[in-house]
């Protein structure tokens, strides 16, 4: 049994880091493998993560952490029974993938303005809480070409757009994702999408 692709890990910078790797053949990850992780601190102890299958030869493990700070470093040991298959280290702050925003809501009752709001996925005491920026994706269910991205570079989790920038009388969907420049993170996953029917009063044409 050998590791074909070494574990790569990303952290949500709150409580979970996710590591993925591939073995050289079909593997029952949960019964054959264990990933041990330990904070590099004299008095810390190793924790055991039981991996799950992620495709035939792929494994994924969700490492639980009390919290994360920028200088934390973890040792990682991948074991198959008594055999050490791989040894490495992981600094969560250098591999951050933020949590996805939630509770995306479209408010359509604000005088021909669409107000989209969502929730910051972090509690106020987490460093990322004040460092997230967002991308909002809006698309038409009827027209695949009607697809747009709005970059929200301010901290407030909301976006206002004129309803008239979208076509009237058809249904749209929106979703939002987040990233943090301070840690050069990857983008989060998209939030669940929300749907609304776009309608607004056409302005009277004057001749």
């Amino acid at each position: 049994m050998k590791v074909l692709q070494e574990p790569t890990c990303v952290s949500d910078y709150m409580s979970i880091s996710t590591c993925e790797w591939k073995m050289n053949g079909p593997t029952n990850c949960s019964t054959e493998l264990r990933l041990l992780y330990q904070l590099v601190f004299l008095l810390s102890e190793a924790h055991t993560c039981i991996p799950e299958n992620n495709g035939g030869a792929g494994c994924v493990c969700h490492l639980l952490m009390d919290d994360v700070v920028s200088a934390d470093n973890y040792t990682l040991d991948l074991w198959a029974g008594q055999q050490l298959l791989w040894k490495g280290s992981f600094k969560p702050s250098e591999h951050v993938k933020p949590r996805a925003p939630g509770n995306l809501t479209v408010h359509t009752n604000v005088s021909d303005t669409l107000l989209l709001t969502w929730s910051n996925p972090y509690p106020p005491d987490n460093y990322l809480y004040n460092h997230l920026t967002y991308a909002v994706n809006i698309w038409s269910e009827n027209d695949p070409a009607d697809f747009r991205i709005y970059n929200v570079t301010y901290l407030e989790p909301s976006l206002r757009i004129a309803a008239s920038t979208l076509k009237s009388g058809i249904s749209y969907r929106a979703r939002v994702r987040a990233w943090a420049q301070c840690y050069n993170t990857t983008w989060s996953e998209w939030s669940p999408s929300t749907k609304w029917h776009n309608s607004y009063r056409e302005p009277f044409e004057q001749h």
Epitope: F41, L42, L43, S44, E45, V69, A71, D72
Partner: antibody
Framework: EVQLLESGGGLVQPGGSLRLSCAAS????????MSWVRQAPGKGLEWVSS????????YYADSVKGRFTISRDNSKNTLYLQMNSLRAEDTAVYYC?????????WGQGTLVTVSS | QSVLTQPPSASGTPGQRVTISCTGS????????VNWYQQLPGTAPKLLIY???QRPSGVPDRFSGSKSGTSASLAISGLRSEDEADYYC???????????FGGGTKLTVL
Amino acid sequence: EVQLLESGGGLVQPGGSLRLSCAASGFTFSNYAMSWVRQAPGKGLEWVSSISPSGSSIYYADSVKGRFTISRDNSKNTLYLQMNSLRAEDTAVYYCARSYRAFDYWGQGTLVTVSS
Amino acid sequence: QSVLTQPPSASGTPGQRVTISCTGSSSNIGNNDVNWYQQLPGTAPKLLIYYDSQRPSGVPDRFSGSKSGTSASLAISGLRSEDEADYYCATWDASLSAYVFGGGTKLTVL
């Protein structure tokens, strides 16, 4: 809110014994290493002993090795320090501290006086 | 005598910047993370800096830590009267297999 409350201090004669306790609340005690640090009157801080979350790793300062025993009861959220063969130089305020990356939370301390 | 050497005292006027040094060796500061603790008069110590330069939440950014080789420093800018306290550096010493504190520095705000 993390809280650490030491108890068990008092006056004891040289050669005597004392058992200190530290009751922890506000965090998952079994996930954290714990330590004892002392401070003699008018002096600086001196590390005494540390214990890992499960109790599998234990460390002592040379000045107390063989006389003091650190232990913990994770079911009771309590840290202990059994002190035997006490000497005058053990007189100090004894603090318990949660130990995660550093001694990040401290109790208010309990005074141990060794005197005849 | 401590294996970590700190000046016994330091002082400054309100608004000033003061620096407290901590000198060790390769068996302690040179290869381990340095922590700084503040002890206000009559109270328990409080963690001020960990991992050489990290501040716990709630510690003002007026406090900063740094490390170079076998020495560490604590800087306090915009000095305030409430900063008057004893400050201790600390780290693990591999050769002693012990957690060691500096002797402490008494900071006076004039």
